[in-house]
């Protein structure tokens, strides 16, 4: 029961996280104009990964897409790539994890297969979360660097009477959404990996034949070994010792009244 809950919760947390990563990637407010000494502004600038926007005090908003690919900073391209990789991995992870869910039964899928799928999706979620966190952090670092550079420029090179006020940008809402979403996806992935451990059967190697000593002495009969070995028609042991090939997880794969998980 705990394994199912862990897996289900991991799935839900990852789903929320990936939705957040998608939202953050699409958001325009990755960087917003720093209002340092002017809390009310007539023209407010903010930028996303795909376009930059200007909102006037009247409410008028104008957004312009970055219609160039080669002219964009390499860092921005890297952030875009990281976020897209995060989304793609997350989406694949979600798809895989749906089939891996213990509560969803598809044909006669074995628990070992579900465990592997759970682990795969978990790893995908972890990498997806890390990609998002890395992307957001790279962008944040870029902002911090540019912020201090523009601050330095504001107080130097003013030569004449005319001031050119450089627009400084600070962290936008998308960064916080991205960090939280990345963290959630990461946590979801870890939960899926933990759930995988519970799903995976404890592999007991039954390939070595187990001989039970019979209660009475057995005379050697050249005709065969049916008398007391475990290979005969001993129905009591058949399920476990059927050729030494079947393991416990196969036993579990048939629903029975003892199948609580």
């Amino acid at each position: 029961m705990a394994v199912t809950a862990c897996q289900g919760l991991g799935f839900v947390v990852s789903l929320i996280g990936i939705a957040g990563i998608i939202a953050a990637t699409c958001m325009d407010q990755w960087s917003t104009q720093d209002l340092y000494n002017n809390p009310v502004t007539a023209v407010f600038n903010y930028q996303g990964l795909w376009r930059s926007c200007v909102r006037e005090s009247s409410g008028f908003t104008e957004c312009r897409g970055y219609f160039t690919l080669l002219g964009l900073p390499a860092m921005l391209q890297a952030v875009r790539a990281l976020m897209i990789v995060g989304i793609v991995l997350g989406a694949i992870g979600l798809l895989v994890s749906i089939f891996a869910l213990k509560c969803i039964r598809i044909g006669s899928m074995e628990d070992s297969a579900k465990a592997n799928m759970t682990l795969t999706s978990g790893i995908m979620f972890i990498v997806s979360g890390l990609c998002a966190i890395a992307g957001v952090s790279v962008f944040a670092n870029m902002l911090v660097t540019n912020f201090w550079m523009s601050t330095a420029n504001m107080y130097t090179g003013m030569g004449g009477m005319v001031q050119t006020v450089q627009t400084r940008y600070t962290f936008g809402a998308a960064l916080f959404v991205g960090w939280v979403a990345g963290g959630l996806t990461l946590i979801g992935g870890v939960m899926m990996c933990i759930a995988c451990r519970g799903l995976a059967p404890e592999e007991t190697n039954y390939k070595a034949v187990s001989y039970h000593a019979s209660g009475h002495s057995v005379a050697y009969k050249p005709g065969g070994f049916k008398a007391s070995t475990g290979f005969g028609s001993n129905t009591k042991n058949k399920k476990i010792y059927d050729g030494g090939a079947r393991t416990e997880d196969e036993v579990q794969s048939y629903p029975s009244k003892h199948d609580y998980v």
């Epitope: 007539a42 023209v43 409410g59 450089q166």
Partner: antibody, heavy 119, light 113 residues
């Protein structure tokens, strides 16, 4: 047809206060900012402040803080500017104007209200 | 606050002439976000409220005759009236519409001979 109708001329005593009104018609009052401008004889235009009638948010020129108070009544589509502790320096024509959607420019103006402070 | 300086303070021309008036701002009015200059021109005829002529430095308001042209960027702006008409007798104001508080130039008074 957008129209901003301002209240009539006022002659007031020094130290008192006056409330100038600006009734808007022909557009959605809460969707546009209303700005107030002061014009003294022989001088240029002076920006007093702005109000967002939709959420009653205001922004004042530092020079007019404590002097002017901007309010708006959504039900009557009317913006108000109250001037307090009047002195002769406050004698001027006051205009209300609507901010156009784009450019932060004032596209429609009231006819102006003359305020004369005299003892 | 941004200081707006207009020149000349007045000018007298004959009808049909081309007129240019200047407006300078103490800070750049160019917004990097949309590459637009937040400078507005108004015309105020005697006994009337001002009317909007040009916004974003060179975008004419609807209904404004095309003889009115705005130009310039950053801190230096110009209003040009091609072939001045008698009805253009007015005071012309430039305004910073980039940052609060909005500030106006002292105006250029246009007189017709």
């Amino acid at each position: 047809q957008v129209h901003l109708q301002q209240s009539g001329a006022e002659v007031v005593r020094p130290g008192t206060s006056v409330k100038v009104s600006c009734k808007a018609s022909g557009y959605a009052f809460t969707n546009y900012l209303i700005e107030w401008i002061k014009k003294r004889p022989g001088q240029g235009l002076e920006w007093v402040g702005v109000i967002n009638p939709g959420r009653s948010g205001t922004n004042y020129n530092e020079k007019f803080k404590g002097k002017a108070t901007l309010t708006a009544d959504k039900s009557s589509s009317t913006a108000y500017m109250q001037l307090s502790s009047l002195t002769s320096d406050d004698s001027a024509v006051y205009f209300c104007a609507r901010t156009r959607y784009g450019g932060n420019a004032m596209d429609y103006w009231g006819q102006g209200t003359s305020v004369t402070v005299s003892s | 606050d941004i200081v707006m300086t207009q020149s000349p303070s007045s000018l007298t021309v004959t009808a049909g002439e081309k007129v240019t008036m200047s407006c300078k701002s103490s800070q750049s009015l160019l917004n990097s976000g949309n590459q637009k200059n937040y400078l507005t021109w108004y015309q105020q005829k005697p006994g009337q409220p001002p009317t909007l002529l040009i916004f974003w430095a060179f975008t004419r308001e609807s209904g404004v005759p095309d003889r009115f042209t705005g130009s310039g960027s950053g801190t230096d702006f110009t209003l040009t009236i091609n072939s001045v008409q008698a009805e253009d007798l007015a005071v012309y104001y430039c305004q910073n519409s980039y940052s609060y508080p909005f500030t106006f130039g002292s105006g250029t008074k246009l007189e017709i001979k």
